[in-house]
């Protein structure tokens, strides 16, 4: 498999058959698949060097792994997008052997003197062809030469099979399956041959191709493949339940932010709640996690403005649940990214020198910002797309707080909507779905560059649009939701999560 190890070294060779038998639309589809693969790999913070070859009678090398920009995913994608099927029109035979020889030439080194670290570099060849080679001879001989060069299958104790993966995608109207199978790697419990119909569900294909065991702690990563559970799609999501004898129970959501902490809303708890009465589950697991302590933001005080006639005051409505035992990350349990951390800098593919302010400008620009939250409906987690009103609609969004029960007498809305809040909901630019009571404490998320970054914690809503946890279809335009802006509580997060290796900026 493609081992995505951010600290490792990898070369990926994209080889695309542009011969007559492929056809223009299949060529375009294959290109799209490769573009998606480049993006998927880049989303892991991995920076492989790419080689890019198209071929028919002759190969054409568009990107060499030795080029400075070959590890720049955006630049490689641009080169790929600029390739036309017509480029091989005049000489449109199929010489797959020559194309693989072009790959071999990129792999090999001058004077037979291998460079430092050559033996730690993994090589991945992704060949898109119909397998109908009609000139140049059998391409399998070049695969054998490549295996020799990389010393694969020669050392009984260290066969190095994981240093070469050859994936073959059958494209075109007619595919020679025998030829394709012969070229692809054969490894136990792995799939290296894919068909055209597989490419309709690329996430399923990538799931078969990628080994992410070295990057399970990466924040904000998800799997969207069809066989995935709700928690593959939102592996940070935590369900919180507080049992109060004789008073029923309170349900909330939260987000895994590190191996020991779940971030949620402070109002989910009261000072009387004992740790043993708080149930937290992650990854869709039945068992509850043991709680060590709940840490409230020191400035949170729901009764802080009772004298001023404000029954409930949600400023600084954030809490961290510290777990007794370390979480074991996997594909259904992994952290969400937090603002102003090194992990988010890498997730957004920003320079290492990026400041907290620059992250803020990237994630919360002064405009309507597409975001999402995760809600549970009929025992299924679903993503709800909303817009954070952070531009010209911000004022009107915040003013609608006056329609909230108990806030009708508030003279100055900034008394309840402090600078700590982000506002979503309403009908412009689109009709946003609203949060339900049980969504409280869950993350408000910005999805960028295939990664998920938490920017807020769901706190309170103007209108209870949910009866029995079912959202009403018709909701008033003033149905707004307010979320604690994580950029505004960073000193507290940084202090409480200082031992979690998140690298706060």
């Amino acid at each position: 498999k493609i081992v995505l190890d951010p600290s490792g070294s990898m070369n990926i060779y994209l080889v695309l058959d542009g011969s007559d038998s492929i056809g223009a639309s299949n060529f375009t589809g294959a290109k799209k698949c490769l573009v998606n693969l480049i993006e998927k790999v880049a989303s892991y913070g991995v920076k492989p060097r790419y080689g890019l070859v198209t071929y028919a009678t002759y190969p054409k090398i568009w990107v060499k792994v030795s080029e400075a920009d070959s590890s720049n995913a955006d630049w490689v994608t641009k080169q790929l997008n600029e390739i036309n099927y017509e480029d091989h029109k005049l000489k449109s035979g199929t010489n797959t052997k020559k194309a693989l020889q072009a790959v071999y030439s990129m792999m090999s080194w001058p004077d037979d003197v291998p460079p430092e670290g050559w033996n730690r570099t993994r090589h991945v060849i992704i060949l898109m062809t119909d397998g109908l080679h009609n000139m140049g001879g059998d391409p399998i001989t070049v695969i054998d030469e490549i295996r020799d060069l990389l010393y694969i299958g020669k050392d009984r104790k260290n066969p190095r099979e994981d240093y070469l993966d050859v994936y073959v995608f059958g494209v075109g109207p007619l595919v020679n399956q025998v030829n394709i199978n012969a070229l692809a790697s054969k490894k136990d419990n792995e799939q290296h041959v894919f068909k055209v119909k597989d490419m309709e569900n690329l996430e399923d294909v990538f799931y078969q191709m990628i080994d992410e065991s070295q990057s399970l702690s990466l924040c904000g990563m998800v799997w969207e493949h069809r066989k995935g559970t709700d928690y593959h799609k939102q592996p940070w999501q935590a369900k919180i339940s507080v049992i109060r004898p004789s008073k029923g129970h309170e349900s909330c959501m939260g987000a895994v932010v590190s191996e020991y902490f779940v971030l949620t809303a402070a109002h989910c708890f009261t000072v009387d709640d004992k740790e043993h009465s708080i149930k937290v589950s992650v990854g869709g697991e039945k068992r509850d996690l043991e709680i060590e302590v709940v840490l409230f933001h020191p400035n949170y005080n729901i009764n802080g403005k009772k004298e001023a006639g404000i029954p409930e005051f949600y400023d600084y409505d954030v809490a961290l649940i510290k777990l007794k035992n370390k979480l074991k990350y996997g594909q259904t349990i992994r952290p969400i990214c937090l603002p102003c951390t090194e992990g988010t800098t890498r997730a957004l593919r920003l320079p290492p020198t990026t400041t907290c302010q620059q992250q803020k400008e990237e994630l919360l620009p002064a405009q309507d910002i597409k975001a999402l939250f995760v809600s549970e409906e009929e025992k299924k987690l679903t993503r709800k797309e909303v817009y954070i009103k952070n531009g010209d609609k911000k004022g009107s969004c915040e003013r609608d707080a006056q329609y909230a029960p108990g806030y009708d007498k508030v003279k100055d809305i900034s008394e309840v909507v402090t600078p700590r809040f982000l506002c979503t909901g309403g009908v412009s630019p689109y009709a946003d779905p609203n949060t339900c009571r049980g969504d409280s404490g869950g993350p408000l998320i910005v999805h960028k560059r295939s990664r998920f970054i938490q920017v807020g914690v769901i706190s309170w809503g103007v209108v209870d649009v949910c009866k029995n946890q079912k959202r009403q279809k018709q909701v008033p335009a003033h149905a707004r939701d307010f979320h604690i802006n994580l950029f505004q509580v960073l000193p507290w997060l940084k202090e409480k999560l200082q031992d979690e290796d998140l690298g706060f900026l």
């Epitope: 037979d112 050392d155 104790k157």
Partner: antibody, heavy 121, light 111 residues
Framework: EVQLVESGGGLVQPGGSLRLSCATS????????MSWVRQAPGKGLEWLGF??????????EYAASVKGRFTISRDNSKNTLYLQMNSLKTEDTAVYYC????????????WGQGTLVTVSS | EIVLTQSPATLSLSPGERATLGCKAS??????????MNWYQQKPGQAPRLLIY???NLESGIPARFSGSGSGTDFTLTISSLEPEDFAVYYC?????????FGQGTKLEIK
């Protein structure tokens, strides 16, 4: 055809030095471990050390009895293995063999004919 | 280091007889499903010759009357029917752990 030919043996005084060579042909030299083995007169075989193949950067490994005194090196451009022997003792008297150590099964599948080293005053 | 003890030190047999040579390791020479034990034959004035690798695999060009067996710490070289040219010294050698080590040898002589 695989061939290994040792040279450089001879008479040397205790405390002296000697460099043995093993010229090879018929195979891709850099892809193989290469070992030195010796046999004292009337005694059994003693493995001295090897030079690993290219994946491991040709790093050497030694038997405790010669560590610090003997050095194994190779010149891949000449397909030649070397054994530099310093601070020689009378008990180093032996026939010295170089052998190709096949990493496909970690066994010495080809041997040279041997070169005699005599350490005596 | 792994110490290999061969038995017997000397074995006297006649041509046509079956020879069984033993080799015991001070610790297991198995790794990842393979046993890294090899057998060599050496005749006077000649370099050793590989007979069996990885405990039971016959090196190419070696007659089928030679066979190897065993795993872990106990290994056997068997010559099913001795030919005159088989009388020599036989060494076992482990290549599982560095440093490699040889057994002290078993001398197979004509009775």
């Amino acid at each position: 055809e695989v061939q290994l030919v040792e040279s450089g043996g001879g008479l040397v005084q205790p405390g002296g030095s000697l460099r043995l060579s093993c010229a090879t042909s018929g195979f891709t030299f850099r892809d193989y471990y290469m070992s030195w083995v010796r046999q004292a007169p009337g005694k059994g075989l003693e493995w001295l050390g090897f030079s690993r193949h290219r994946v491991y950067g040709y790093t050497p490994e030694y038997a405790a009895s010669v560590k610090g005194r003997f050095t194994i090196s190779r010149d891949n451009s000449k397909n030649t293995l070397y054994l530099q022997m310093n601070s020689l003792k009378t008990e180093d008297t032996a026939v010295y063999y170089c052998a190709r150590d096949n990493p496909g099964y970690y066994a010495m599948d080809y041997w040279g004919q041997g070169t005699l080293v005599t350490v005596s005053s | 280091e792994i110490v290999l003890t061969q038995s017997p030190a000397t074995l006297s047999l006649s041509p046509g007889e079956r020879a069984t040579l033993g080799c015991k390791a001070s610790q297991s020479v198995d790794y990842d499903g393979d046993s890294y034990m090899n057998w060599y034959q050496q005749k006077p004035g000649q370099a050793p010759r590989l007979l069996i690798y990885a405990a039971s695999n016959l090196e190419s060009g070696i007659p089928a009357r030679f066979s190897g067996s065993g795993s872990g710490t106990d290994f056997t070289l068997t010559i099913s029917s001795l030919e005159p040219e088989d009388f020599a010294v036989y060494y076992c050698q482990q290549s599982n752990a560095d440093p490699y080590t040889f057994g002290q040898g078993t001398k197979l002589e004509i009775k």
